[in-house]
């Protein structure tokens, strides 16, 4: 028993009119000694469960039950865990920024899409907020790989994404094919002018037959890109 409230330890309370340090009653606490009252302990119930139980000197600490996460200072509320395509921030669940994904349910942060070009591979399927990009097999590059910069969420951070190398390679291949066919057409036209006796049948029929035979080789590159039908010259 002391005669001054100033000397009281945490876990006690003391009234000025009767300066005696008294222990806090059950389910109450005081982290500072000499206060006229002890504080009521926090109860963790419902979506909350105890992280730390209350003692005479410290309040209880709560955390959220499985499937929920804390929000606010000292875990004042519980919010349902994030879905795939989201990540937790102070404000709660936020959709992944452009160029990032999260395929996990309830946990994890948004991470960048795989940079396929690091392994010399092309992008087969572009990514979403829930799924990473799908990289194709290694490609023989027809042109130097190009990069574009996407500025996520309007922030200054830039996310380096490889441009679809496969698309560029196919475009280059098709262009070359078109140039070759055009040249071939011109050469045939010149030969027809120079040596008309070679062409007994009309020219159109000959090229038509050639096109029919070659329809497959003409359509194959398009089919790879999901297109259909042959080229018409």
């Amino acid at each position: 028993v002391q005669n001054s409230c100033d000397n009281c330890q945490p876990g006690t309370f003391c009234r000025k009119y009767n300066p005696v340090c008294k222990s806090c009653p059950p389910s109450t606490f005081s982290s500072i000694g000499g206060q006229p009252n002890c504080n009521i302990c926090r109860v963790c119930a419902g979506y909350f469960r105890f992280k730390k139980f209350c003692s005479s000197t410290h309040n209880a600490e709560c955390e959220c039950i499985e499937g929920f996460h804390c929000l606010g200072p000292q875990c004042t509320r519980c919010e349902k865990d994030c879905r795939p395509g989201q990540e937790l921030t102070k404000q709660g669940c936020k959709t992944c920024s452009l160029g990032t994904f999260n395929d996990q349910n309830g946990t994890g942060v948004c991470r960048p899409w795989t940079n396929c070009s690091l392994d010399g591979r092309s992008v087969l399927k572009t990514g979403t907020t829930e799924k990473d990009v799908v990289c194709g097999p290694p490609v023989v590059s027809f042109s130097p790989s190009t990069t574009i910069s996407v500025t996520p969420e309007g922030g200054p951070g830039g996310h380096s994404l490889q441009v679809l190398t496969l698309f560029l390679a196919l475009t280059s291949a098709l262009l070359l094919a078109l140039i070759f066919i055009t040249l071939l057409f011109s050469v045939l036209k010149w030969i027809r002018k120079k040596f008309p006796h070679i062409f007994k049948q009309p020219f159109k029929k000959t090229t038509g037959a050639a096109q029919e035979e070659d329809a497959c080789s003409c359509r194959c590159p398009q089919e790879e890109e999901g297109g259909g039908g042959g080229y018409e010259l």
Epitope: P73, Q74, E87, L88, T89, K90, Q91, K94, S97, G99, T100, T107, G108, V109, C110, R111, P112, W113, T114, N115, L118, D132, P152, E153, G154, G155, P156, G157, H159, S160
Partner: antibody, heavy 121, light 111 residues
């Protein structure tokens, strides 16, 4: 025990490149972001960019885009930062730091010891 | 551009309390977590406060963090100042979850 150990100090000529390494241990290297931050003499902390070692995905600060390149070697749990076209203003201590995977706006819980890069002719 | 502004320096006597502010110039201070790092000369930064008001294990309870929405700023308060608290202190938050932002740093001098 989680540790990030960086390579030693470097002295470089203007226009050249420097490659700083950051070897991680004590945790799953592929499951946490590695951030790169620099501090010029007597100045504050400046974000350069970050890498997700799990797939090599990167983010770069606008100021460093095109000059900084991040890579990660998962076999040795080492992250690398290469900075090209060096100029005297790039003289700084370069830090790597790890961010926990709790939230997208989380703190950096572990830092490397720093690598001093001096750019001088 | 999002900026966090800190006082260049603060000083106080041992045993006293000091508060370092970190003001966000645009946006809402409540949008993203604020973290505080201590950096002693020649050393790497170490976390003193994370996620606005949480203390890592080993950091004394003399250190506390808070958010004030009315002034759009965060604060680091150190009570019972000790000479070993003399260091640079940096606040850290985000402009987006991809873009971290640091305050300019505050040099704390314990007189």
């Amino acid at each position: 025990e989680v540790q990030l150990v960086q390579s030693g100090a470097e002295v470089k000529k203007p226009g050249s490149s420097v490659k700083v390494s950051c070897k991680a241990s004590g945790y799953t290297f592929t499951s946490y972001y590695i951030y790169w931050v620099r501090q010029a003499p007597g100045q504050g902390l400046e974000w350069i960019g970050n890498i997700w070692p799990g797939n090599g995905g990167t983010f770069y600060g606008e100021k460093f885009m095109g000059r900084a390149t991040f890579t990660a070697d998962t076999s040795t749990s080492t992250a690398y930062m290469e900075l090209s076209s060096l100029r005297s203003e790039d003289t700084a201590v370069y830090y790597c730091a790890r961010r926990p995977d709790y939230s997208g706006d989380d703190y950096f819980d572990y830092w490397g010891q720093g690598t001093l890069v001096t750019v001088s002719s | 551009n999002v900026m966090l502004t800190q006082p260049h320096s603060v000083s106080e006597s041992p045993g006293k309390t000091v508060t370092i502010s970190c003001k966000l110039n645009s946006g809402n201070i409540g949008s993203y977590y604020v973290h505080w790092y201590q950096q002693r000369p020649g050393s790497s930064p170490t976390t003193m406060i994370y996620r606005d008001d949480k203390r890592p294990d080993g950091v004394p309870d003399r250190f506390s963090g808070s958010i004030d929405s009315s002034s759009n700023s965060a604060s680091l308060t150190i009570s019972g100042l000790k000479t070993e608290d003399e260091a640079d202190y940096y606040c850290h938050s985000y402009d987006s979850t991809i873009t971290p932002v640091f305050g300019g740093g505050t040099k704390l001098t314990v007189l």
